[in-house]
């Protein structure tokens, strides 16, 4: 019986040029997590494998990072990142969990975002 | 199997600079946070922040911005971290841990005392 | 930032006895970790995801909690468990750990 729940970060929006972290996270459930898929819509942007570490797809290296935690942050966003997203939780034995979260790119500044992750 | 070995204890002046070292092995360093934490007597663990090797990405408690900074060298599987203008209050033992989802892996600790 | 507060600080238990230690969130979070440390090793991690306990920690170990309440609890103290115990939030950056719980045994 899956008896987990999932917390996301729910429908956010940024600005464009600028960057977002997605957050899901999976409680209530003793539940081993193996894998986390980030995917938009039916590409996948990003593996967090329990024993292999993070795998970013490499049509997105350069504006995808691992992290903080589980998540993931966008950067250099463009209007056409808007869209739904997907955490996708693999556990064992429960199964899959699945977040979805929506993120609308803005071209002015009204936008929030907080990103705090950085590439030197 | 997975291993965090860190550099040796440090004796410092204040306002000197030291930096300490964690090399892993047994696993892809690439792939994994490497997050580095501050114990003192009595105060508990702190964090100070974080580093992506794969591509040097960095996550900073804000207490800690000016204070320390990482690198890492991913043809020598090693994270580094220096902290400046060293006092008494950076007189601690520093843990490097990998992370992925908690800390799963930590290095033995490298005690940095700051005396004159 | 988000606060996690250990109660007690200092504990000492009986064998045998029941222990409770508990972390207290100053705003909810998803789930905590546990991590055991022992004087002179560096600290280990107990019990994942507030109720997962890590590989070879004792059954007589759990972890339970929601929102601000989380608790890790010793149905039958031994003498391997007296350890500082320090719970994490990996909610919300920065990542904060508990003030720690000493538990002696008696």
């Known amino acids: 019986m899956m008896t987990g729940t999932i917390e996301t970060t729910g429908n956010i929006s940024a600005e464009k040029g600028g960057s977002i972290i997605l957050q899901c996270h999976l409680s209530s459930t003793t539940a081993q997590v193996t894998q986390v898929n980030w995917e938009q819509q039916d590409q996948l942007l990003a593996i967090c494998n329990a024993d292999l570490g993070w795998h970013i797809s490499p049509s997105f290296k350069d504006r995808v990072a691992p992290g903080p935690g589980l998540g993931l942050t966008l950067q250099s966003l463009t209007v056409n990142d808007t869209g739904e997203y997907f955490c996708i939780y693999h556990t064992y034995p429960d199964g899959t969990y699945t977040g979805r979260i929506f993120l609308e790119v803005l071209e002015s500044s009204v936008a929030e975002h907080g990103a705090r992750f950085q590439i030197p | 199997q997975v291993q965090l070995q860190q550099s040796g204890a440090e004796l410092m002046k204040p306002g000197a600079s030291v930096k300490i070292s964690c090399k892993a092995t047994?696993?892809?360093?690439?792939?994994?946070?490497i997050e580095w934490v501050k114990q003192r007597p009595g105060h508990g663990l702190e964090w100070i922040g974080e580093?992506?090797?794969?591509?040097?990405?960095?996550n900073y408690n804000e207490k800690f911005k000016g204070k320390a900074t990482f690198t890492a060298d991913t043809s020598s599987n090693t994270a580094y971290m220096q902290l400046t203008s060293l006092t008494s209050e950076d007189s601690a033992v520093y843990y490097c841990?990998?992370?992925?989802?908690?800390?799963?892996?930590w290095g033995q600790g490298t005690s940095v005392t700051v005396s004159s | 930032q988000i606060v996690l507060t250990q109660s007690p600080a200092i504990m000492s238990a009986s064998p045998g006895e029941k222990v409770t230690i508990s972390c207290s969130a100053s705003?909810?979070?998803?789930?905590i970790h546990w991590y055991q440390q022992k004087a002179g090793s560096s600290p280990k991690p107990w019990i994942y995801?507030?109720?997962n306990l890590a590989s070879g920690v004792p059954a007589r170990l759990s972890g339970s909690g929601s929102g601000t309440s989380y608790f890790l609890t010793i149905s039958s103290m031994e003498a391997e468990d007296a350890a500082t115990y320090y719970c994490?939030?990996?909610?919300?950056?920065?990542?904060?750990f508990g003030g720690g719980t000493k538990l002696e045994i008696k």
């Open positions: 841990a990998r992370h992925l989802g908690a800390l799963d892996y």
């Open positions: 047994g696993y892809t360093f690439s792939r994994y946070w």
């Open positions: 580093i992506f090797p794969g591509s040097g990405g960095t």
């Open positions: 705003s909810s979070v998803s789930y």
């Open positions: 995801r507030t109720s």
């Open positions: 994490q939030q990996y909610h919300s950056n920065p990542w904060t």
